[in-house]
């Protein structure tokens, strides 16, 4: 599989980690989260050309079948391979509590 | 999150398991696999509308930000949540061997 920087579509166009700034309102969290007021959301965005960052055998199959039947089988998709944890200060009935979420921010990406 | 059958886009249009019949030639495996000659490839295909089969918090965030910034943030993508193993009879220099692959056939799907 090609490495993360070797994108045949041009620099930065293939599957990679992006950061999107979002407020609590943007995320629909304003009613249950107190802090942070803004989050630097890391997510996986970009194209998955042939064998680029292929996660596994299934991704390789998908690439082959997409080439044969593009109307039936979609190309592999850029999704998180792992996550970074994040702590939220949440509103509760009586005040606030701390809650850590392990599946909130993408850490690195692959194609599947 | 909505269950797997409650697709707002119409029956069968949302993220779910599909079976695609593929030959060894289709898969590019003819030179190294002896059997099976044809595979019933199970894969995840379909749309991921708001909160449909959301895999985790990240998928929920992605839905919210896609709604706000559709040109920047893609919608969640339909990918395998787990896999079924599959055994292949592989050609070797001296004959054949059995090899089990754990990441080849999708077992069920979610949006991420």
């Amino acid at each position: 599989a090609r490495n993360g920087d070797d994108c045949p579509l041009g620099p930065g166009r293939c599957c990679r980690l992006h950061t999107v700034r979002a407020s609590l309102e943007d995320l629909g969290w304003a009613d249950w989260v107190l802090s942070p007021r803004e989050v630097q959301v890391t997510m996986c965005i970009g194209a998955c050309p042939s064998q680029f960052r292929a996660a596994n055998m299934h991704a390789q199959i998908k690439t082959s079948l997409h080439r044969l039947k593009p109307d039936t089988v979609p190309a592999p998709c850029c999704v998180p391979a792992s996550y970074n944890p994040m702590v939220l200060i949440q509103k509760t009935d009586t005040g606030v509590s701390l809650q850590t979420y392990d599946d909130l921010l993408a850490k690195d990406c692959h194609c599947i | 999150a909505r269950n797997g059958d409650d697709c707002p886009l119409g029956p069968g249009r949302c993220c779910r398991l599909h079976t695609v019949r593929a030959s060894l030639e289709d898969l590019g495996w003819a030179d190294w696999v002896l059997s099976p000659r044809e595979v019933q490839v199970t894969m995840c295909i379909g749309a991921c509308p708001s909160q449909f089969r959301a895999a985790n918090m990240h998928a929920q965030i992605k839905t919210s930000l896609h709604r706000l910034k559709p040109d920047t943030v893609p919608a969640p993508c339909c990918v395998p949540a787990s896999y079924n193993p599959m055994v292949l009879i592989q050609k070797t220099d001296t004959g054949v061997s059995l090899q089990t692959y754990d990441d080849l056939l999708a077992k069920d799907c979610h949006c991420i």
Partner: antibody, heavy 118, light 107 residues
């Protein structure tokens, strides 16, 4: 559960460098939004914030002590270190490390007493 | 630096009394104020976040209010175990600063 444990030399001579370590458990120093802060308290006096370090390695220091302070972390060891150079008797205090979440000290260690005396 | 000034410095009250401690910031800090309780020989313990939100496990007799520059910590019915020093802290901007503390005693 969240725990923080300070360790230090106990006794130092004036002009020496104080080195403190905070070992944490129950949370990760790489968690977004998480930091560790150092606060000190001279006997019978109030709390004075010294420094903090965030998950992304951002560091902040008490403006009056900035030239003497250095904070660092080793995420793999779950440790945060603080160094205070050129100590004097005025630096005698109980030194606390605390879990800092978006500016707020949610959990505190038990503290370690540091005495500066010749 | 933002100064946080607490009053009174010492407060003596009876069990069952309503007790109020105030904290004044030298400039607007929004609602970015926390309150802590420190009992003798112990580290401080978080009570209130964001001026008015009680931390999980804190008894509901403790409440906080205020925004901008004026903040209040109230104990609705003082208990013997509330004997402690109480500190406010602003986290609106660095450097973080604490009030000088209010010592609460039982009459």
């Amino acid at each position: 559960q969240v725990q923080l444990q300070e360790s230090g030399p106990g006794l130092l001579k004036p002009s020496q460098t104080l080195s403190l370590t905070c070992t944490v458990s129950g949370f990760s120093l790489s968690t977004y939004g998480m930091g560790v802060g150092w606060i000190r308290q001279p006997a019978g006096k109030g709390l004075e914030w010294l420094a903090n370090i965030w998950w992304n390695d951002d560091k902040y220091y008490n403006s009056a002590l900035k030239s003497r302070l250095t904070i660092s972390k080793d995420t793999s060891k779950n440790q945060v270190s603080l160094k205070l150079s050129s100590v004097t008797a005025a630096d005698t205090a109980v030194y606390y490390c605390a879990q800092e979440v978006y500016g707020w000290f949610a959990y505190w260690g038990q503290g370690t007493l540091v005495t500066v005396s010749s | 630096d933002i100064q946080m000034t607490q009053s009174p410095s010492t407060l003596s009250a009876s069990v069952g009394d309503r007790v109020t401690i105030t904290c004044k910031a030298s400039q607007n800090v929004g609602t970015n104020v926390a309150w802590y309780q420190q009992k003798p020989g112990q580290p401080p313990k978080a009570l209130i976040y964001s001026a008015s939100y009680r931390y999980s496990g804190v008894p509901d007799r403790f409440s906080g209010s205020g925004s901008g520059t004026d903040f209040t910590l109230t104990i609705s019915s003082l208990q013997a175990e509330d004997v402690a020093v109480y500190y406010c802290q602003q986290y609106n901007s660095y450097p973080l600063t604490f009030g000088q503390g209010t010592k609460l005693e039982i009459k």
